[in-house]
């Protein structure tokens, strides 16, 4: 698996989505989970609903909400006030008796200011990027949410690094 | 392991490059953060590095005063501080941090790197 | 900014001595929190994480607690290499900030 990085400013929230095959993975849950070091297991963060049918409910662990489009075959994970111990290594999974499969490996960048990346240009406007090996960068800003505020899509510039 | 450059005297207004080579572990796989400590004070963060990627996140402080990149293929994180002045006189540290993170601080430090700016 | 306020500034103590420092977060920093102990020499060395967790290798007369926004390290028992200067350090938040430290003597 190649990993995509998704970089998000501290105090805002951050949306990471997974896309997978809806046929492959019908009747699966989802889960997120943040691999802790090296080697080891992926620490569950959360999962989607019990009941497959009603996996486009939003569940929050924490500050992290998961929601899942089975039809659109599209997972979302949303870090609400993102802090910079957020940043890591993560994984969206698809969940089958005591296997999990992965669907995207997910790095989160927490930046602390939208302007401190060396190619802080690409966070607002797309544009060609140095050197991230195969790595695929999802620059995601958005504004902070308030309290039981449902998030909103943010704007996304994907670019695919070779 | 993180072995940091020697010590360095250079004149006011003048910039230096100072060097942190990691080695016993996956460079790409940790942050790597900057501290300064001016003699005989506590210590300030000045900034982290993500090696993998090359983002970075600075303290307001040191915006415009330090600049911090890395050579994956050395294993190694620079820190370039330019326009000296006498405040700038410290002794700096690199600390790494954890797992494409920073969410349990800094395990592991160099032995410091000594900067003195003086005419 | 977060301010970590730590006490006290100096502290000479005997061998075998109880000794407890601490720092007050100016905000919530919800347990990222780390001490470190710095040697004469300059050497640091991360002694706890998470407000209470104990780096691997390090004695276990060193011990960490929290009681709200106070966060305390307290050494059971003086040794004659635990003389050296103490930092707390929060990672809650950007920036980072470090406490203004405490220097623990031989009294």
């Known amino acids: 698996h190649n990993t995509t990085v998704f970089q998000g400013v501290a105090g805002q929230s951050l949306q990471v989505s997974c896309p997978y095959d809806s046929m492959k993975h019908w009747g699966r849950r989802k889960a997120w989970c943040r691999q802790l070091g090296e080697k080891g297991p992926c620490q569950r963060v959360v999962s989607t609903h019990n009941l497959w049918l009603l996996s486009f409910l939003r569940r929050w662990n924490g500050s992290t909400a998961i929601t899942d489009d089975t039809l659109g075959g599209t997972l979302t994970i949303t870090l609400r006030n993102l802090q910079p111990h957020d940043a890591g290594l993560y994984q969206c999974q698809s969940l089958h008796g005591s296997e999990a499969d992965t669907l995207r490996k997910v790095l989160v960048e927490v930046l602390a200011d939208p302007l401190d990346h060396r190619d802080a240009g690409d966070l607002w406007f797309p544009g060609e990027s140095e050197s991230f090996e195969d790595a695929h960068v999802e620059h995601s800003i958005s504004r902070s949410l308030l309290e039981g505020e449902i998030p909103f899509p943010p704007t996304s510039h994907h670019h695919h690094h070779h | 392991q993180l072995q940091e450059s020697g010590p360095v005297l250079v004149k006011p207004g003048a910039s230096v490059k100072m060097s942190c080579k990691a080695s016993?572990?996956?460079?790409?796989?940790?942050?790597m953060n900057w501290v300064k400590q001016s003699h005989g004070k506590s210590l300030e963060w000045i900034g982290v590095?993500?090696?993998?990627?090359?983002?970075?996140s600075y303290n307001q402080k040191f915006k415009g005063k330090a600049t911090l990149t890395v050579d994956k293929s050395s294993s190694t994180a620079y820190m370039e501080l330019n326009s000296l002045t006498s405040e700038d006189s410290a002794v700096y540290y690199c600390?790494?941090?954890?797992?494409?993170?920073?969410?349990?601080?800094?395990?592991?430090w160099g032995q410091g790197t000594l900067v003195t700016v003086s005419a | 900014d977060i301010q970590m306020t730590q006490s006290p500034s100096s502290l000479s103590a005997s061998l075998g001595e109880r000794v407890s420092l601490t720092c007050r977060a100016s905000q919530e920093i919800s347990g990222y929190l780390s001490w470190l102990q710095q040697k004469p020499d300059g050497t640091i060395k991360r002694l706890i994480y998470a407000a209470s967790t104990l780096d691997s290798g390090v004695p276990k007369r060193f011990s960490g607690s929290r009681s709200g926004s106070d966060y305390s390290l307290t050494i059971s028992s003086l040794e004659s290499e635990d003389f050296a200067d103490y930092y707390c350090?929060?990672?809650?938040?950007?920036?980072?900030?470090f406490g203004g430290g405490t220097k623990l003597e031989i009294k």
């Open positions: 590095i993500n090696p993998y990627t090359g983002a970075t």
């Open positions: 600390a790494r941090g954890t797992y494409y993170s920073n969410y349990e601080g800094f395990p592991y």
């Open positions: 350090l929060q990672y809650a938040s950007y920036p980072y900030t």
């Open positions: 016993g572990y996956t460079f790409t796989d940790y942050y």
